[in-house]
């Protein structure tokens, strides 16, 4: 018999896999739903369940999933259903892997740290290669030399400062120069070194309606790549933006709604009301998106517990173009690159 | 308001094809399914498609499976059935209807004003 | 397919009368039943949802009632505008069935 996916949190014991190998139907449609949707634990998503049919509290991480009992999306959840073989119909929500990366013709896994070479070491985070230098000689020490030279030193990675500019002297090298720089407390070498690096921020995940965008930054205390989100709503999806198109135009680019009004997030409430812009829609196959943009800080206030800010796009202009042949792929932007499809997959 | 507004009805000759269209507004089309239900001249109500929130789940009633194709765009806010093989038993006026599974399941709560298909030679 | 026979076909009343509409389901559909009014030309209109609740903005004349498979629509002191024709529709199960109306004529 099939169940009927419940609101609250879901545990399930599967069979042991030689009793049974017939996939339980966890959904049951027409849809039945029960006459109001369930209130989430702080910080739990409600969310439409995987029968696409009722509002549930999304499944964390750990937690059992099936096809009805889905895991929370908003935290990058999916159902791992490895453990369940041969049925593959109990899992367990884990954390999504992010796509590999390709650096110079070579394939690494999401997550992998590697050498490129000797200076530096690098690591792939969903598609996008962040590298921290390992060459930390800091700068000429000023204190003497006026003309200071990067020299290659046989048998070591890492060029040296030597300086030229005192016959009197001789050459001193990066280990001398290192101890007398580092010895008038000018420069902390680690972070002097620190390759600034952010990565742009990717689609939003939903050409409609809440979703999420990341990118890559390493501009952190510990100049360590670091994946941010924030959240983004390219138009809301419950307005039809055709309808405000004027007469003989085929675009709206932008569309703003006439009043302000608050942000919601899992049942929490933004602390002030917003009057967003939106990006529009064209009646041919041209699409909108951002072009000028920021993130703001938005504060929620939930109705039970504490309240907490998140990252949010806000969009100032949008532009309609022919470039986007499938506006839900969150990579196509990345198809213009090389070895894009090496990434993709 | 919420709203359903469907196009798309012509004369088309049997073996013919068809694409109906379903706008809808006022509402948050992609949190319900969308049905398609007919009505034959002089006749009754019948059932012919159904489509889940995001397309992952279909079904079609066993008249018209296989020669009609029920599909959406959440982006666009549009209900669509593509319509193969027509024959004069498909006449009739085309609904569009907003399945309720709001709050329980409660068959439909909101329908189009219909558009004619008419089916001769 | 679970097949809905309605009774009567037609009906015949005046405004005031109390009339009363039948839907008989071929299997039971517990209270996963609607009852639609349509006029000549209109879109059909949900009077009656779950068997038994009043859909929002329907006037109070109209009630439900039954389980499983037998279930009844009243309406009790017609006015001009119910003239029309019923249906009920059973969404327990696919296919979606609706009965064969009744169509409900002034006297």
């Known amino acids: 018999t099939a169940l009927s996916p419940t609101p609250t949190t879901m545990t399930f014991t599967p069979a042991p896999l030689e009793e049974t190998t017939t996939r339980p139907e966890f959904c049951k449609w027409p849809c039945e739903c029960p006459q109001s949707p369930p209130r989430c634990p702080l910080g739990v998503s409600l969310i439409t369940d995987g029968c696409e049919c009722c509002k549930i509290c999304a499944q964390q991480l750990g937690d059992n999933c099936t096809e009805a009992a889905i895991c929370d999306p908003h935290r990058g959840l999916y159902c791992d259903y490895s453990g369940d073989r041969p049925r593959y119909a109990i899992g367990v929500c884990a954390q999504v892997v992010g796509v590999g990366c390709v650096l110079d013709g070579v394939r690494y896994t999401n997550g992998e740290s590697f050498q490129p070479n000797c200076r530096y070491n690098c690591t792939c985070i969903d598609g996008t290669v962040g590298c921290t230098p390992l060459c930390l000689s800091p700068r000429p020490p000023r204190l003497w030399c006026r003309q200071p030279r990067h020299v290659r030193v046989p048998g070591q990675c890492c060029e040296q400062w030597v300086c030229d500019d005192d016959a009197r002297r001789p050459r001193q090298t990066a280990l001398l120069d290192t101890r007398a720089f580092a010895a008038s407390g000018a420069v902390e070498q680690r972070y002097e070194n620190c390759i600034a690096y952010t990565s742009p921020w990717s689609p939003c995940s939903t050409t409609c309606g809440l979703g999420i965008s990341t990118r890559i930054s390493n501009v952190n205390a510990r100049c360590w790549p670091e994946q941010e989100s924030r959240l983004c709503n390219l138009r809301p999806c419950d307005v039809d933006i055709q309808l405000h198109i004027k007469a003989g135009k085929k675009c709206l680019a932008v569309y703003q709604p006439e009043e302000a009004t608050n942000f919601t997030l899992a049942g929490c409430v933004s602390t002030r009301t917003y009057r967003p812009k939106y990006c529009g829609v064209c009646t041919d196959n041209r699409c909108c998106i951002p072009y000028k943009s920021k993130t703001i800080s938005v504060d929620f206030q939930c109705p039970e517990g504490p309240g907490f800010s998140r990252q949010v796009l806000w969009i100032n202009a949008c532009f309609c173009n022919l470039s986007c042949r499938n506006p839900n792929d969150i990579f196509a932007d990345l198809e213009s690159y090389p070895d894009f499809e090496e990434i993709a997959n | 308001q919420v709203q359903l507004v469907e196009s798309g009805g012509a004369l088309v000759q049997p073996g013919g094809s068809l694409r109906l269209s379903c706008a809808a507004s006022?509402?948050?089309?992609?949190?319900?399914?969308l049905s398609w239900v007919r009505q034959a001249p002089g006749k009754g109500l019948e059932w012919v498609s159904s489509?889940?929130?995001?397309?992952?789940?279909?079904h079609y009633a066993d008249s018209v499976k296989g020669r009609f194709t029920i599909s959406r765009d959440n982006a666009k806010n549009s209900l669509y059935l593509q319509m193969n093989s027509l024959s004069a038993e498909d006449t009739a006026v085309y609904y569009c209807?907003?399945?309720?599974?709001?709050?329980?399941?409660?068959?439909?709560?909101?329908w189009g004003q219909g558009t004619m298909v008419t089916v001769s030679s | 397919a679970i097949q809905l026979t309605q009774s009567p076909s037609s009906l015949s009343a005046s405004v005031g009368d109390r009339v009363t509409i039948t839907c008989r389901a071929s299997?039971?559909?517990?209270?996963?039943l609607g009852w639609y009014q349509q006029k000549p030309g209109k879109a059909p209109k949900r009077l009656i949802y779950?068997?038994?609740s009043l859909q929002s903005g329907v006037p109070s004349r109209f009630s439900g009632s039954g389980s499983g498979t037998e279930f009844t629509l009243t309406i009790s002191g017609l006015q001009p505008e119910d003239f029309a024709t019923y249906y009920c529709l059973q969404h327990n199960s696919y296919p979606f069935t609706f009965g064969q109306g009744t169509r409900l004529e002034i006297k």
């Open positions: 209807a907003r399945e309720d599974t709001s709050m329980a399941t409660n068959g439909f709560d909101v």
């Open positions: 489509i889940s929130s995001s397309s992952r789940y279909i």
């Open positions: 779950a068997a038994s």
């Open positions: 299997q039971g559909i517990r209270n996963h």
């Open positions: 006022g509402f948050t089309f992609s949190d319900h399914w």
